[in-house]
Interface confidence: low
């Protein structure tokens, strides 16, 4: 025979419990029905009658099977900075969450008690950590070679566009401006929003908003057969390449001839021992910067002859947008006799991307003026070793070049000879948009 189904109310067997969705009424000493979600107990059971349930009134609810005498009141209406993601029904409480562009500054068990607007990063700063439902945006200064020209809670620092010929170098809040030749860029030129797809390796632009200090390189003086920047998407038109190459080659030959003539006349050239500093500045050192990294523009010693290179400090200074911000740590103001390079990667997360190497080479054409020759080859290399601590960073490490090195080198040696082993291939050498600034 099938077991009899007990209908509520019923007396449980000694030592046993009531079934699911039943409760034991201690007065009636019977197992009685619970009320379903959306209802409450209007009359409790007796030995002969089961629980009488009633629907919850407006703006009240019960979420569980229950035997409460009265339903719970729904929470108050959502405030203007909130969105009602779950309406108050007879079976569930109202849930308020923050509307887009806001985050929950003070949460409660379900939904949010207090919303606050997401921080917006101003130009020169990008999003280091995106906002979430419960945390605000974290901004960081754009590192050299990157920029952000928007006030946004989603835009990260983007790499400067890579120009054939730079008209105006970029800085932390402005992209590089190219001359009429079409630029190449490792990513689409539009504003980069989070989250962001993984880009090419050389640019280091990863989904976590940690743009590295990959400088955009202007190919003013191609030194030998340089391949295009890794990750660049466009090929240079052949005629343009020929014109630039021939022009550059001509200028170089003139420079060499000048130097040779001056040497044979026994007028020893006043090759200034320009020194390229190679400070191993860790990313940590720049973490506490008040503002974005300064974009230092390279200037050469004034020369009476003009060339395709800007030789006037004042001309460059006029073009460079001055930023009234404290000088970034590790970037010392240099005199005309020396060029100092440094990088400070404002990395908001420890570890960063490991060692990053930026190698730049600047070649000045020798020119003769008042029987004195001025020629200099300046090499500046920067390495941000995210694993080294600030105390390990040599304060004033100088890498002088000998007088014989005043003539340009075709490849300026490999960066490994200057910096030791590196993890990444250097970008092709050229004049960076972020160079040195005279004091």
């Amino acid at each position: 025979l099938p077991a009899q189904v007990a209908f509520t109310p019923y007396a449980p067997e000694p030592g046993s419990t009531c079934r699911l969705r039943e409760y034991y009424d201690q007065t009636a000493q019977m197992c009685c029905s619970k009320c379903s979600p959306g209802q409450h107990a209007k009359v409790f059971c007796t030995k002969t009658s089961d629980t009488v349930c009633d629907s919850c009134e407006d703006s009240t609810y019960t979420q569980l099977w229950n035997w409460v005498p009265e339903c719970l009141s729904c929470g108050s209406r959502c405030s203007s900075d909130q969105v009602e993601t779950q309406a108050c029904t007879r079976e569930q409480n109202r849930i308020c969450t923050c509307r887009p562009g806001w985050y929950c500054a003070l949460s409660k068990q379900e939904g949010c008690r207090l919303c606050a607007p997401l921080r917006k990063c101003r130009p020169g700063f990008g999003v280091a950590r995106p906002g979430t439902e419960t945390s605000d945006v974290v901004c960081k200064p754009c590192a050299p070679g990157t920029f952000s020209n928007t006030t946004s809670s989603t835009d990260i620092c983007r790499p400067h566009q890579i120009c054939n010929v730079v008209a105006i170098p970029g800085n932390a809040s402005m992209d590089a401006v190219c001359t009429s030749t079409s630029p190449t860029r490792s990513m689409a030129p539009g504003a980069v929003h989070l989250p962001q797809p993984v880009s090419t390796r050389s640019q280091h632009t990863q989904p976590t908003p940690e743009p590295s200090t990959a400088p955009s390189t202007s190919f003013l003086l191609p030194m030998g057969p340089s391949p295009p920047a890794e990750g660049s998407t466009g090929d240079f038109a052949l005629p343009v390449g020929l014109i630039v190459g021939v022009t550059a080659l001509g200028l170089l030959i003139i420079g060499v001839v000048n130097c040779v003539i001056m040497t044979q006349v026994k007028k020893k050239p006043l090759c200034l021992q320009r020194e390229a500093k190679v400070p191993h500045l860790p990313a940590d050192k720049a973490r506490g910067t008040q503002g974005p990294e300064q974009q230092h523009l390279l200037i050469t010693a004034p020369s009476s002859s003009s060339s395709s290179l800007e030789s006037s400090a004042s001309a460059l200074d006029r073009r460079a947008p001055t930023r009234n911000q404290p000088q970034a740590p590790g970037v010392e103001a240099s005199g005309a006799g020396e060029a100092r390079a440094s990088t400070g990667s404002s990395d908001s997360s420890p570890g960063g991307h490991g060692t990053q190497v930026n190698v730049t080479c600047i070649v000045n054409v020798c020119s003769s003026s008042d029987h004195s020759s001025q020629c200099s080859s300046q090499a500046s290399s920067t390495m941000g070793d995210t694993d080294s601590s600030p105390s390990e960073s040599p304060k004033d490490e100088q890498v002088p070049f000998s007088k014989e090195e005043c003539a340009f080198r075709s490849q300026l040696e490999t960066p490994e000879t200057l910096l030791g082993s590196t993890e990444e291939k250097p970008l092709p050498l050229g004049v960076p948009d972020a160079g040195m600034k005279p004091s």
Epitope: Q26, T27, P69, L72
Partner: antibody, heavy 122, light 112 residues
Framework: QQQLEESGGDLVKPGASLTVTCTAS?????????MCWVRQAPGKGLEWIGC????????TYYANWAKGRFTISKTSSTTVTLEMTSLTAADTATYFC??????????????WGPGTLVTVSS | DIVMTQTPASVSVPVGGTVTIKCQAS??????LSWYQQKPGQPPKRLIY???TLASGVPSRFSGSGSGTEFTLTISDLECADAATYYC??????????????FGGGTEVVVK
């Protein structure tokens, strides 16, 4: 062992505000519990102030006389507060924190704290 | 709010005697009623809930009865330790916009 303890009782002047806190130990607030406040003036009877259903940070329920001047809040998974404003001498009392239940009507007011004394006097 | 009226306010009973305390609700609270015992300097202790169910650890000398609006607490075989103030409380829904959690005014029991 499950316990409640009130703190924050003090001597304050009329018109002042005061917040007293109830801290639970041995358990944390769950869907099953309400936390309530009851007060008792010296030599007088017990007076129910209100309750909060802390697991969803509300709703709160108050005696009609307590609405407006008294606010019950959950500040953590083991603490609730009673904020009192515009205090008068009539509010001088020992304030008790009491645990109640949502899903078992047979377990009402089964756990009490020792109370904290609030004195309102100029 | 519901109003709970408790009588008498005070009663004096000899040891071994029986005391009966009445509690009246201003409206029906079914059997949502608890009884508490409070001694000086201590918080109340629950004796009975759901009108007639003894809380754990409470002697069977204590009993409760009633439903709707009329309730009674009876203490038999009175002991000196029973000297205290006794309160009834409507707990017909702590979320009680309708009923509230009103206490009666209390009954002081003096054991002679």
């Amino acid at each position: 062992q499950q316990q409640l303890e009130e703190s924050g009782g003090d001597l304050v002047k009329p018109g002042a505000s005061l917040t007293v806190t109830c801290t639970a130990s041995g358990f944390s607030f769950t869907n099953n519990y309400y936390m309530c406040w009851v007060r008792q003036a010296p030599g007088k009877g017990l007076e129910w102030i209100g309750c909060i259903y802390p697991s969803i940070v509300g709703p709160t329920y108050y005696a009609n006389w307590a609405k407006g001047r008294f606010t019950i809040s959950k500040t953590s998974s083991t603490t609730v507060t009673l904020e009192m404003t515009s205090l008068t001498a009539a509010d001088t009392a020992t304030y008790f924190c009491v645990r109640d239940r949502y899903d078992d009507y047979g377990d009402y007011f089964n756990l009490w704290g020792p109370g904290t004394l609030v004195t309102v006097s100029s | 709010d519901i109003v709970m009226t408790q009588t008498p306010a005070s009663v004096s009973v000899p040891v071994g005697g029986t005391v009966t305390i009445k509690c009246q609700a201003s409206q029906s609270i079914y059997n949502y009623l608890s009884w508490y015992q409070q001694k000086p300097g201590q918080p109340p202790k629950r004796l009975i809930y759901y009108a007639s169910t003894l809380a754990s650890g409470v002697p069977s000398r204590f009993s409760g009865s009633g439903s709707g609006t009329e309730f009674t607490l009876t203490i038999s075989d009175l002991e000196c330790a029973d000297a205290a103030t006794y309160y009834c409380q409507s707990n017909s829904g702590v979320n009680g916009n309708r009923y509230g959690n009103a206490f009666g005014g209390g009954t002081e029991v003096v054991v002679k």
